[in-house]
């Protein structure tokens, strides 16, 4: 697997003081920041659950895997990880659950080997469009990121600054076309109501996309056509009612795709006929025998694969004069 090792042997701990002391000199090769644990053998630094309010300045140059989880960082400024000499080997950075509410433009600049970034479980009210691209150029230098984990980054309703959260996240994903090499993108548990139509077309290298546990109602305007390499598409626990012909055809045309659709409130009326026919024939959907109707009431808990065209009717629409209030 590509994930960094989350436990490493032979850690050394530094003295628990001067948590955010600024060092003018480059750190010594074996130096370990205060409140952190370091293993040079495993090239891993862990500063976990220490209530740090900023990124330690004296990170050792050897660090490949950096865990800064469970802290109180609040803001990641531009160049938050820029060092002299640079952290040239840093490949995996985990900032989950560190109370980040703002990630500024260029926060991850000067990390030439950064392949994996996890910002999950932070209430990101302000994610700069240039957080990942580092510049406002129309085409930025390619980001080295291959895996971007953004699960549960939605802030509380009252902190959303009166703008589309989906739009803010997508702007950061698309800025400068910097993330063309991204292969894993996780956006689970973010209350997404929709997926902006252009987002996937500009992430052509995706192999794994996780949109589970959102509030997606429809995929009608989302195109999967360019995602030749997509292998897993997680859409469990959304608000999907039906998948229409265009979407079904696009998914079927992806050579390696596996789609996960459990726990959606499927509406089993006449509009579902094409999807049921497709489900019976396709190998694309994992666990398709578990998919059940949620509506209408008379169809609740019926297994989609067991339905036939006679089951899928639409009540006639009454003219307004005959409708009851």
């Amino acid at each position: 697997s590509s994930s960094p090792t989350s436990s490493a042997s032979s850690f050394s701990s530094s003295a628990p003081f001067l948590a955010s002391a600024v060092s003018a000199q480059p750190p010594l090769p074996d130096q370990c920041p205060a409140l952190c644990e370091c293993s040079e053998a495993a090239r891993t630094v862990k500063c976990v659950n220490r209530n740090l309010t900023e990124v330690p300045t004296d990170l050792p140059a050897y660090v490949r895997n950096l865990f800064l989880t469970g802290n109180q960082l609040a803001v990641l400024p531009a160049g938050a990880f820029a060092r002299r000499p640079p952290l040239a080997e840093l490949a995996a950075l985990n900032l989950s659950g560190s109370r980040l509410d703002e990630v500024r433009a260029g926060a991850f600049e000067h990390l030439p080997s950064l392949r994996q970034l996890d910002l999950s479980h932070n209430p990101l009210a302000d994610l700069s469009p240039f957080a990942f691209s580092g510049s406002n150029a129309s085409v930025s230098a390619p980001s080295p990121l291959v895996e971007l984990i953004l699960n549960h980054i939605v802030p509380p309703e009252d902190e959303r600054q009166n703008r589309s959260f989906e739009g803010m996240v997508v702007a950061a994903l698309l800025a400068g076309r910097a993330l063309q090499g991204l292969r894993r993108l996780e956006l689970a548990s973010n209350h997404f109501l929709y997926l902006p139509r252009d987002v996937l077309a500009q992430l052509p290298s995706l192999r794994h996309l996780d949109l589970s546990n959102n509030s997606l109602v429809s995929l009608t305007y989302v195109s999967f056509r360019n995602l030749t390499h997509l292998e897993s598409l997680h859409l469990e626990d959304n608000a999907l009612k039906v998948l229409h012909n265009g979407t079904l055809a696009e998914l079927q045309g992806l050579p390696h795709i596996r789609v996960f659709l459990d726990n959606n409130p499927w509406v089993c009326d006449c509009h579902m006929a094409d999807m049921v026919t497709w489900l019976k024939e396709t190998e694309v959907v994992q666990g398709k025998d578990r998919l059940t109707c949620a509506y209408p009431e008379k169809m609740r808990n019926r297994v989609l694969l067991e339905l036939n065209s006679a089951d899928l009717d639409c009540d006639p629409i009454l003219p307004p004069s005959l409708q009851t209030s």
């Epitope: 697997s1 590509s2 080997s113 392949r115 291959v146 895996e147 090499g181 292969r183 894993r184 290298s205 192999r207 794994h208 390499h229 292998e231 897993s232 050579p255 390696h256 795709i257 596996r258 190998e283 694309v284």
Partner: antibody, heavy 116, light 113 residues
Framework: SVEESGGGLVQPGGSLRLSCAAS????????MSWVRQAPGKGLEWIGI???????YYASWAKGRFTISRDNSKNTLYLQMNSLRAEDTAVYYC????????????WGQGTLVTVSS | AQVLTQSPSSLSASVGDRVTITCQSS????????LSWYQQKPGKAPKLLIY???TLASGVPSRFSGSGSGTDFTLTISSLQPEDFATYYC?????????????FGGGTKVEIK
């Protein structure tokens, strides 16, 4: 881990099916590949099966070699037909990383000898 | 078909030496980065050292490093250790409209001088 089996002595023109049993992970969630190595020679890629079952082969292997798998048995197979002396080799199965296109888990290999 | 040319095919070196092995592809590997390096000892399966051209696999000592992009790649051992005497292979991944193709270099045998 992965473990190959089914190797042995086979006559030229004969057929053989190799197995690769996976444990600790679900075979259907990964791309899996077969690689061989003739005695004293280098590694040679045979082919690969994707998570959903698509297969791709080296040009020399097309037609004679077939990769398949049985998800219920968590086992990968390599069917080899019309075997020749030059197919004598150690055959390895290898798992492909879920993100990168690299072989990150190898079996110990099984020796196939084609001889009359 | 894609061809990976490794050089040298063999080399003799001493403990502590810096060793460089090159791998040239007849066409660009997928995403310019999908080049891996493996170490193999006699009678053993290959072991992944480096993937994505320059990323060290878990548990691999930092004296190993990889570089390059597109068609030209290098494996460097900064200070050769006794356990490093082995054969090294590069492996590239390729994608075209007709699908995936993988190829190995011919190998470089690192022997004790």
């Amino acid at each position: 881990s992965v473990e190959e089996s089914g190797g042995g002595l086979v006559q030229p023109g004969g057929s053989l099916r190799l197995s690769c049993a996976a444990s600790g992970f679900s075979l259907s969630s990964y791309w899996m590949s077969w690689v061989r190595q003739a005695p004293g020679k280098g590694l040679e890629w045979i082919g690969i099966i994707a998570g959903r079952g698509s297969t791709y082969y080296a040009s020399w292997a097309k037609g004679r070699f077939t990769i398949s798998r049985d998800n219920s048995k968590n086992t990968l197979y390599l069917q080899m037909n019309s075997l020749r002396a030059e197919d004598t080799a150690v055959y390895y199965c290898a798992r492909v990383s879920s993100i990168y296109y690299t072989f990150n888990l190898w079996g110990q290999g099984t020796l196939v000898t084609v001889s009359s | 078909a894609q061809v990976l040319t490794q050089s040298p095919s063999s080399l003799s070196a001493s403990v502590g030496d810096r060793v460089t092995i090159t791998c040239q592809s007849s066409q660009s590997v997928y995403s310019n980065n999908e080049l891996s390096w493996y170490q193999q000892k006699p009678g053993k399966a290959p072991k992944l050292l480096i993937y994505y051209a320059s990323t060290l696999a878990s548990g691999v000592p930092s004296r190993f490093s990889g570089s390059g992009s597109g068609t030209d790649f290098t494996l460097t051992i900064s200070s050769l250790q006794p356990e490093d005497f082995a054969t090294y292979y590069c492996q590239g991944s390729y994608y075209s409209g007709s699908g995936w193709y993988y190829a190995f270099g011919g190998g470089t045998k690192v022997e004790i001088k």
